[in-house]
């Protein structure tokens, strides 16, 4: 016996109470695929969430976060508080980045300043809580006798060896 439910399109469900007739999803529910035996409950976007896309009979609602919060998790399942640049979110709230670290976004954690000396370079612009350091030429390049008029060597294209 062929399963009549497989004929039910998205936006409907196969109603076993009515001899497997395809019934439309009731209000506040949806089915995004055909052949469903029930419709799923629509997500609500309330409180700290706001509606980005309304629920329809064939697709769930999509939520965003209100101003001052940003989405986390799959399909914006959570809203996390924004912090200011130069801060990170801890269990106790937004805290300034420790010395030697920075965060240039409203989310995420404070990251250590780049260590210019690891690349044989010097610090051109000091780091702040909001900005990473800017590395400049190596100290040797800046020593007396080194010509500042020499144009920099052209950057190599990745994967190409020098001619």
């Amino acid at each position: 016996l062929q399963d009549l439910c497989s004929n039910c399109p998205a936006g409907t469900f196969c109603d076993n109470n009515r001899s497997q007739i395809c019934s439309p999803c009731p209000p506040n529910s949806f089915s995004s695929a055909g052949g469903q035996r029930t419709c799923d409950i629509c997500r609500q976007c309330k409180g700290v969430f706001k509606t980005r896309k309304e629920c329809s009979s064939t697709s769930n609602a999509e939520c965003d976060c209100i101003s001052g919060y940003h989405c986390l998790g799959a399909e914006c399942s959570m809203c996390e508080q924004d912090c200011k640049q130069g801060q990170e979110l801890t269990k106790k709230g937004c805290k300034d980045c420790c010395f030697g670290t920075f965060n240039d976004q409203k989310r995420g954690i404070c990251r250590p300043w780049t260590n210019c000396s690891l690349d044989g370079k010097s610090v051109l612009v000091n780091g702040t809580k909001e900005r990473d350091v800017v590395c400049g030429p190596s100290p040797a390049d800046l020593s007396p006798g080194a010509s500042s008029a020499t144009p920099p060597a052209p950057a190599r294209e990745p994967g190409h060896s020098p001619q």
């Epitope: 997500r43 609500q44 309330k46 409180g47 969430f49 959570m78």
Partner: antibody, heavy 118, light 111 residues
Framework: QVQLQESGPGLVKPSETLSLTCTVS????????WSWIRQPPGKGLEWIGY???????NYNPSLKSRVNISVDTSQNQFSLKLNSLTAADTAVYYC????????????WGQGTTVTVSS | QSVLTQPPSASGTPGQRVTISCSGS????????VNWYQQFPGTAPKLLIY???QRPSGVPDRFSGSKSGTSASLAISGLQSEDEADYYC???????????FGGGTKLTVLG
Amino acid sequence: QVQLQESGPGLVKPSETLSLTCTVSGGSISSYYWSWIRQPPGKGLEWIGYIYYSGYTNYNPSLKSRVNISVDTSQNQFSLKLNSLTAADTAVYYCARTHSYYYGMDVWGQGTTVTVSS
Amino acid sequence: QSVLTQPPSASGTPGQRVTISCSGSSSNIGNNPVNWYQQFPGTAPKLLIYSNNQRPSGVPDRFSGSKSGTSASLAISGLQSEDEADYYCEAWDDSLNGPVFGGGTKLTVLG
């Protein structure tokens, strides 16, 4: 499964501040709303306010000037402070978890009776 | 004065079907799903129906919910003596950005 337990004083004097704490056990405080609801003797349920785990709050306008709700995710607790108490604040106070998908209050504490009297 | 309006009392005999109504406005029931709670004396409310007509696990299928426009109703079929309790409707209110409750209905099972 998730359980909620209210704690705080049972008797408070008029004009003082009520402080209640709700401890969440058996689950995480993250990704839910946490509400306070009260029920005066012989009356219905009144929503006081909620806090989302990341700190967003909203309060019943009739109580907004007197209420503060805070959350401590490290302790898995959230708290209610209600100031300038009068006898009309005498009630059973419940904490509850509000689901952040369909917004039903699916887990409740057993409630704590607060009497405002001198 | 509750935002949602329920009859203060309802009654029925064992085996009967009873319905409890809940009336609101466009900012709450008209635009949002309705939840129902059952409360026995001296205990905390329990979620009975969510999203208009969904039953949490463990709730008997004798309990059903429906919504039309700015009103909702809870139906209890095959009424039993243990159904005697207070019933509250609740919905999110967009103007408050929070939930609102009905005043509650005391259900009495006669006989």
